[in-house]
């Protein structure tokens, strides 16, 4: 007679991700009587909900549920009908949503009412939808990448079953860019953390972690181009806005008052002698990179050191995971491996951003223009993050590993919230029994 | 500007089968869903199925299961349709189309091919 | 399979004045709170247009003289003032699940 596979004993989470462009839905899955160990939570999928972020919806509040339904019927397909009403479903907040806040407290909860209206009418465990801060955002994606790259396991290994790994405990700095905000998180070298504000204490696995985090927001790839916008705009002596960071031959109309739309401009903000402009672009890296280097304000720092705008960073330590649109841009601009050096990814955005917009739109013909035409400053940008903002040199570079997806998983904070939610991250190592671990590799 | 582009019309003879193409302009294809729909001369519409480009995902009227499937190519933008065994009963004029949020604003909007017609003939 | 039934089949109405179309399910296509109702129009050699999307919703660019409204299995397609360019097939179709389904089509006339 056949032999009957067993009903596997496994649980399942959901995580959505609710950023400033866009919203995620992640489901993780993990054995049941493996719940503290180690590395045994992986993405099963990921579903992108396709249309903007929930903070566009703020004057259709009412249609939240529809924009949802699509990945919240995807989760019910993905996880058996019997998992159900024992699958917890979270929703983090970030950035986005932080803005909107700033700017209205009741609409931001009117908007995160209406979402946990809809998802309440899912059969999962619905267990809420909060904005998440800057420092937790940080904490996740830090979170998150060690736990996949094994850094938290005790058990040293012969061999490497992870890419990046050093085979040592020692833990990746965790480097995350949004639309909106962008955090940095690593263990500093023996290194007190000045301010308190940037200061986080683990215990995990029994080891204890003295963490730096912070995160900048409005200096996401989104409001960090609304914010040149704005700088530039001010001095233009017409409505033509000439930019650099835009392919020559490329042409778009703005709105002022979208530009002033934002919390993130209010600081650049004057009365204008017309209600548009026209960004004409010249394509020069270099004078991209000057322009967006006047949004770091380095002149200021109580600290020892800091990153910009007064903010303390202690001295960079170890390798760096570099995350979400770190690594989506760099991806499309074909400049994530390990042997691109600094100097040669300067030398491709020179390239890049120097090509006619024509040309450039004919070459990437799928590609929204919209979106198209950002990479030169979005790869602008994270280069001027990463070395003038963060402190990376030519020699640190190698440093930085750009990281999609870690055995399966994304990279970013939806997987490191769930551990914390669920309790799946010990304080203390958990005692190996004979049953959940073998003696032998 | 937001297009869909299908191929051209097709005459083919019964027992065969044809690929038909929706070339997708103005945004990324994986960026939304595709569906396809049939129009049978001076007939309702019918909904074939819908395939969501990002990760290959489908869903299907079940009884167009086995008569036609639904690809997609992001690297080229475009969503195909094949349809196999082929009768007159699928003469028809077929659309892809897409309705559903943009991904920048809150609009829901929706665009659509201009149809391919199949004749089946012998 | 969820049937949508439209009636009436054809009607006709005079410039100005209001155009009413009912959708019937033959189970409700509601869930998770929202009716999963839509409607589109179509005129003669084009493709469907999207007027209406969860029951009540307009489509982008819609005249606000068309609006939508109904739940669970009883829907309507309403168009007021009638004007020329409203003269076309009418389709409600639903999506809670699949298959999705498309009613039978009301092709309104100018009176």
């Known amino acids: 007679t056949q032999n009957k596979a067993l009903p596997e004993n496994v649980k399942y989470g959901i995580v959505l991700d609710a950023g400033s462009s866009h919203t995620s839905l992640y489901i993780y899955k993990w054995p049941a009587e493996k719940e503290n160990d180690t590395g045994v939570v992986h993405q099963v999928e990921e579903c992108r909900v396709k249309g903007p972020g929930i903070s566009k919806f703020v004057q259709k509040v009412n249609e939240i549920g529809i924009y949802l339904t699509d990945c919240m019927e995807r989760a019910r397909e993905v996880i058996p009908r019997s998992q159900h009403q024992e699958t917890p479903v979270y929703l983090g907040a970030t950035a986005g949503m932080r803005l909107l806040r700033m700017e209205s407290e009741e609409l931001a909860d009117r908007v995160l009412d209406v979402v946990e209206r809809s998802l309440s009418n899912y059969p999962f465990d619905f267990q809420g939808a909060r904005i998440i801060t800057g420092q937790e955002e940080g904490a996740y994606g830090w979170i998150t990448i060690n736990y996949l790259l094994g850094k938290f396991s005790q058990k040293t290994r012969w061999f490497s079953i992870v890419p990046y790994e050093t085979n040592n405990q020692e833990t990746f700095g965790a480097l995350d860019l949004g639309g909106a905000s962008t955090q940095v998180t690593f263990v500093p070298q023996n290194q007190t953390i000045e301010s308190p504000d940037n200061a986080l204490q683990f215990r995990l696995y029994g080891k204890d972690y003295n963490v730096y985090t912070h995160s900048f927001l409005c200096y996401g790839k989104d409001q960090a181009l609304w914010q040149k916008l704005a700088k530039d705009i001010q001095v233009a002596s017409n409505e033509i806005l000439r930019d650099p960071c835009f392919h020559p031959g490329y042409k778009k109309v703005v709105n002022v008052s979208d530009l002033y739309k934002t919390p993130c401009t209010k600081r650049f903000e004057m009365t204008l002698p017309f209600q548009q402009f026209e960004i004409q672009g010249i394509g020069n890296y270099q004078q991209c990179h000057q322009s967006i280097l006047e949004l770091f304000n380095t002149s200021y720092c109580p600290y020892s050191q800091c990153a910009f705008n007064g903010i303390f960073l202690p001295p960079l330590q170890g390798d760096f995971g570099a995350f979400s649109a770190f690594y989506f841009v760099m991806k499309f601009l074909n400049l994530t491996s390990e042997k691109v050096s600094q100097e040669k990814v300067t030398e491709m955005m020179k390239k890049f951003c120097a090509q006619p917009w024509e040309e450039i739109k004919t070459s990437y013909a799928g590609v929204k223009e919209k979106y198209l035409s950002e990479y030169c400053f979005s790869g602008t940008y994270i280069l001027s993050l990463l070395l003038q903002g963060y402190h990376f040199t030519a020699d640190s570079w190698e440093h930085i590993h750009f990281i999609g997806k870690i055995q399966g998983s994304d990279a970013g904070w939806t997987l490191g919230y769930m551990l914390n939610l669920t309790n799946m991250i010990p304080a203390e190592q958990p005692l190996s029994t004979p049953l959940s671990h073998s003696t032998y590799v | 500007e937001v297009q869909l582009q299908q191929s051209g019309a097709e005459l083919v003879k019964p027992g065969a089968s044809v690929k038909l193409s929706c070339i997708v302009s103005?945004?990324?294809?994986?960026?939304?869903?595709i569906n396809w729909v049939k129009q049978r001369p001076e007939q309702g519409l019918e909904w074939i199925g819908r395939?969501?480009?990002?990760?290959?995902?489908?869903k299907y009227d079940p009884k167009f299961q086995g008569k036609a499937t639904m690809t997609s190519d992001t690297s080229s933008n475009t969503a195909y349709l094949h349809l196999s065994s082929l009768t007159s009963d699928d003469s028809a004029v077929y659309y892809c189309?897409?309705?559903?949020?943009?991904?920048?604003?809150?609009?829901?909007?929706?665009?659509w091919g201009q149809g391919t017609t199949l004749t089946v003939s012998s | 399979d969820i049937v949508l039934t439209q009636s009436p089949a054809s009607l006709a109405v005079s410039l100005g004045q209001r155009a009413t179309i009912s959708c019937r399910a033959s189970?409700?296509?509601?869930?998770?709170?929202?009716?999963?109702m839509n409607w589109f129009q179509q005129k003669p050699g084009q493709p469907p247009k999207l007027l209406i999307y969860a029951a009540s919703n307009q489509g982008s660019g819609v005249p606000a003289r068309f609006s939508g409204s109904g739940s669970g299995t009883d829907f309507s397609l309403n168009i007021l003032p009638m004007e020329e360019v409203d003269a076309a097939m009418y389709f409600c179709h639903q999506s809670k699940e699949v298959p999705w389904t498309f009613g039978g089509g009301t092709k309104l006339e100018i009176k």
């Open positions: 103005g945004f990324n294809i994986k960026d939304t869903y």
């Open positions: 395939i969501d480009p990002a990760n290959g995902n489908t």
């Open positions: 189970e409700s296509v509601d869930n998770y709170g929202i009716s999963f």
């Open positions: 189309a897409r309705w559903g949020y943009d991904d920048e604003e809150a609009d829901y909007f929706d665009s």
